[in-house]
């Protein structure tokens, strides 16, 4: 009878991450007596995958009675395949023998490859707020892949961005494979209701790639510009004054109001209005008794918006032109809740 | 059903010969080791001897060179000559099959009786 | 030629009992070593092989444990049908050799 031969009929094997892998080894004899183990990798540092004489493998089960003495195939599944299982697969024949089994054959190897497919992709804007015409840095990171090959794109409202670097890690072989990429975006005053998608293709996901979002609302800071005017004339001796507060985001904004360099009145937006554009409007105003004043006064506008320094604009009341009435230093009462009097 | 059955055992004189034979059924008798034990009567067992599955031969000392084990896969039996016969050799003898893969057996047949007396 | 040598050659035990039976090699037989049970007139059944393998069909009561040169044959709960002779065999290398045997008796 000829020498035993092990064949592993199939040179390379690939599976999804979570399914099965089917091994394939058969004997061409029935002798010599002695058992088949199966190992990963070859040469000393090998690892024990099965061993039909003892030990427990929970993830392994026969593909055919290995207990009988007439069996030849020695194939093995192995469950709930992770990429950590990446590997060469040997089935190699030994003879029984004592103190050891001696190793008799073995199989050239069966390649295990692992396709896994990349988490969500996770995208993460810069830590503080910046201003249109600024450019800021978006990343995007995903893991757990294999193989190695991997597509990744930026869109900014669906059109795709040029301006990005990626790198997949590591470099050499891996049981597994991680990717990140930062993509540089201009931002736009109509960028509150943008969108940065980072989206993700791999064979794993059978041409329904992966997307990770980021939105620019949380990115974006837009300052708001502002209009000091005065209204007509409500009554003889009073004059109403606006501070428009317009195209700003986000809405936490504070306004104060200064006359003559003195805070007359300090606000916070509320009632805001918001525009197409995701921006918002806000509209100041104040009462201004003229008859209280004997100089022209000098009204000032002063937002804080989002933290940054206070912008502000003025506003020169003309008192000349309004005669004032003898002995009278009371201001008009208050008709709404961010109307106020000057003295 | 897997089954083994002896038969050929009987009484002979010291010097005599017997020819015991091993009929298998229930599987492919071919891939399989076969074996001989012996036990005497109240007395253990003993293992007698072997033929591989492709032809080859071991036996206890007690018997080299007297017995011959032999195999008929056409036929599915096993076969044991014993020349020169003692009276040490009587026993009852039982085929058993290498069942296991390491060649542990796992079927014996219900064994044949040999005597050996004048 | 390797030596077996089994102990006790005689047990006494009652019905739910639990009992080991020893068996020692002569030499290191790796865990080739086999445990047979037989009851009188009838041809030994194997119970255990590979020193820790439970042959088919054996019920779980029965467990072998041991490699190299020392081997236990262990029966957790004994019922009437186990009172019988058990052997062990060391199958690693030719001749084949057994032990002399326990006889498991009922108290």
């Known amino acids: 009878e000829e020498e035993l031969q092990v064949i592993q009929p199939d040179k390379s094997v690939l599976v999804a991450a979570g399914e099965t892998a089917t091994l394939r080894c058969t004997a061409t004899s029935l002798i010599p007596v002695g058992p088949i183990q199966w190992f990963r990798g070859a040469g000393p540092g090998r690892e024990l995958i099965y061993n039909q004489k003892e030990g427990h493998f929970p993830r392994v089960t026969t593909v055919s009675d290995l207990t009988k003495r007439n069996n030849m195939d020695f194939s093995i599944r192995i469950g709930n395949i992770t990429p950590a299982d990446a590997g060469t697969y040997y089935c190699v024949k030994f003879r029984k023998g004592s103190p050891d089994d001696v190793e008799f054959k073995s199989g050239a190897g069966t390649e295990l490859s692992v396709r896994a497919k990349p988490s969500a992709p996770v995208v993460s804007g810069p830590a503080a707020r910046a201003t249109p015409q600024h450019t800021v840095s978006f990343t995007c990171e995903s893991h757990g892949f294999s193989p190695r090959d991997i597509t990744l794109k930026w869109f900014k409202n669906g059109n795709e961005l040029s301006d990005f670097q990626t790198n997949v890690d590591p470099v050499g072989e891996s049981v597994s494979y991680s990717i990140h990429s930062t993509a540089k975006v201009v931002l736009t005053r109509e960028d509150v209701h943008s969108q940065v998608i980072c989206e993700v293709a791999h064979v794993t996901l059978q041409g329904d790639p992966l997307r990770g979002t980021a939105n620019l609302s949380e990115t974006i800071r837009v300052p708001p510009t502002l209009e000091v005017t005065q209204q007509p004339v409500r009554a003889e001796n009073q004059v109403n004054v606006t501070c428009q507060v317009r195209k700003f985001y986000p809405q936490r904004l504070q306004l104060t109001w200064l006359e003559n360099g003195n805070v007359s009145r300090t606000e916070t937006a509320s009632t805001v209005t918001e525009n197409k554009d995701g921006t918002y409007n806000w509209m100041s105003w104040l009462l201004v008794n003229v008859s209280a004043h004997r100089d022209d006064v000098k009204l000032t506008c002063q937002v804080e918006h989002d933290g940054q320094p206070a912008v502000s604009k003025s506003h020169d009341l003309k008192v000349s032109a309004h005669p004032k009435e003898q002995g009278s230093n009371t201001a008009a009462e208050n008709t709404g809740s961010n109307e106020r009097n000057i003295y | 059903e897997v089954q083994l059955v002896e038969s050929g055992g009987g009484l002979v004189q010291p010097g005599g010969s017997l020819r015991l034979s091993c009929a298998a059924s229930?599987?492919?008798?071919?891939?399989?080791?076969m074996h001989w034990v012996r036990q005497t009567t109240g007395k253990g067992l003993e293992w007698v001897s072997v033929?591989?599955?492709?032809?080859?031969?071991y036996y206890a000392g007690s018997v080299k060179g007297r017995f011959t084990i032999s195999r008929e896969n056409a036929k599915s039996s096993l076969y044991l000559q014993m020349n020169s016969l003692r009276a040490g050799d009587t026993a009852v003898y039982y085929c058993?099959?290498?069942?296991?893969?390491?060649?542990?057996?796992?079927?014996w047949g219900q064994g044949t009786m040999v005597t050996v007396s004048s | 030629d390797i030596q077996m040598t089994q102990s006790p050659s005689s047990l006494s035990a009652s019905v739910g009992d639990r009992v080991t039976i020893t068996c020692r090699a002569s030499?290191?037989?790796?865990?080739?070593l086999a445990w047979f049970q037989q009851k009188p007139g009838k041809a030994p059944k194997s119970q255990i092989y590979?020193?820790?393998s439970l042959q088919s069909g054996v019920p779980s009561k029965f467990s072998g444990s041991g490699s190299g040169t020392d081997f236990t044959l262990t029966i957790s709960s004994l019922q009437p049908e186990d009172f019988a002779t058990y052997y062990c065999q060391q199958y690693s290398t030719y001749p084949y050799t057994f032990g002399q045997g326990t006889k498991l008796e009922i108290k």
């Open positions: 030499q290191d037989i790796n865990n080739y």
């Open positions: 229930g599987f492919t008798f071919s891939s399989y080791d």
């Open positions: 033929i591989g599955i492709a032809g080859d031969t």
């Open positions: 058993a099959r290498g069942g296991n893969w390491d060649d542990a057996f796992d079927i």
């Open positions: 590979t020193a820790s």
